[in-house]
Interface confidence: medium
């Protein structure tokens, strides 16, 4: 049956997928956009109440930021 991911296990899996980038519990939308949007479906809705795969988890990783050469 479908598997769900909740609580600390959800955080652990997000850390596995996202690494130190961090993650959001609500999917960021329209980076740089000032348009107000309807409330987003969050990762708890998608992965705890329903089931999701690792690619779905990746959608909640913080966006990649350009990094300067050290």
């Amino acid at each position: 049956g479908p598997e769900t991911l909740c609580g600390a296990e959800l955080v652990d899996a997000l850390q596995f997928v996202c690494g130190p980038r961090g993650f959001y519990f609500n999917k960021p939308t329209g980076y740089g956009s000032s348009i107000r949007r309807a409330p987003q479906t969050g990762i708890v809705d998608e992965c705890c109440f329903r089931s999701c795969d690792l690619r779905r988890l990746e959608m909640y990783c913080a966006p990649l930021k350009p990094t300067k050469a050290a």
Epitope: T4, L5, D12, A13, V17, G19, L64, T67
Partner: antibody, heavy 115, light 105 residues
């Protein structure tokens, strides 16, 4: 000390099934997510599957999705990989690895898929 | 998807310093932790460097890791014959193709 010991590998025909096991000791088993990683002969490492520390969540590489099932028994400190519909390209040494950094690995078990 | 590119092989004489690069594709690996693994011939991989530059206990300080922009590097100083092995970088569940290190002489 941490020890991971895989077993269950062998020769199987294409389309066949095999179940791998990974027995763990030397650490708090139920606190760590686990993964299976494989290495085809003469090739590099390929992550296969992930299971969360309580076992309620699993993830798979696209190459094995729908054919392989990862599971764990936290009462026996054992990780499993059920492999169905095996293909020649699944031939590899299969390793279990601890945590999200793969900080400890088993010695590996060889799976050969051939007719 | 992230693709990590490593040189297929590097070599050096005993006592020398060698570096192995790990370059990310379109995704910028600068925001990820990079881990390095050593695989001696006929053995399982072993974690060598984690979180870009940290060494697990028991790993000699001849091994060091660094990261800059879209690439990471593993440096080995004072090369020894027992360092001859395959080296892999990784980010989360993605591995580089591996680099075979040959110690000359």
């Amino acid at each position: 000390q941490v020890e991971l010991v895989e077993s269950g590998g062998g020769l199987v025909q294409p389309g066949g099934s095999l179940r791998l096991s990974c027995a763990a000791s030397g650490f708090t088993w139920s606190s760590f997510a686990m993964s299976w990683v494989r290495q085809a002969p003469g090739k590099g490492l390929e992550w296969v599957s992930y299971i969360s520390y309580l076992g309620s969540y699993t993830g798979y590489a696209d190459s094995v999705k729908g054919r392989f099932t990862i599971s764990r028994d936290n009462s026996k400190n054992t990780l499993y990989l059920q492999m169905n519909s095996l293909r020649a390209e699944d031939t590899a040494v299969y390793y279990c690895a601890r945590g999200t950094k793969f900080d400890y690995w088993g010695q590996g078990t060889l799976v050969t898929v051939s007719s | 998807d992230i693709v990590l590119t490593q040189p297929p092989s590097v070599s050096g004489a005993p006592g020398q310093r060698v570096t192995i690069s790990c370059t990310g594709s379109s995704s910028n690996i600068g925001t990820y932790d990079v881990h390095w693994y050593q695989q001696l011939p006929g053995t399982a991989p072993k974690l060598l460097i984690y979180s870009n530059s940290k060494r697990p206990s028991g790993v000699p300080d001849r091994f060091s890791g660094s990261k800059s922009g879209t690439s990471a590097s593993l440096a080995i100083t004072g090369l020894q014959s027992e360092d001859e092995a395959d080296y892999y970088c990784s980010i989360t569940r993605v591995f580089g193709g591996g680099t075979k290190l040959t110690v000359l002489g």
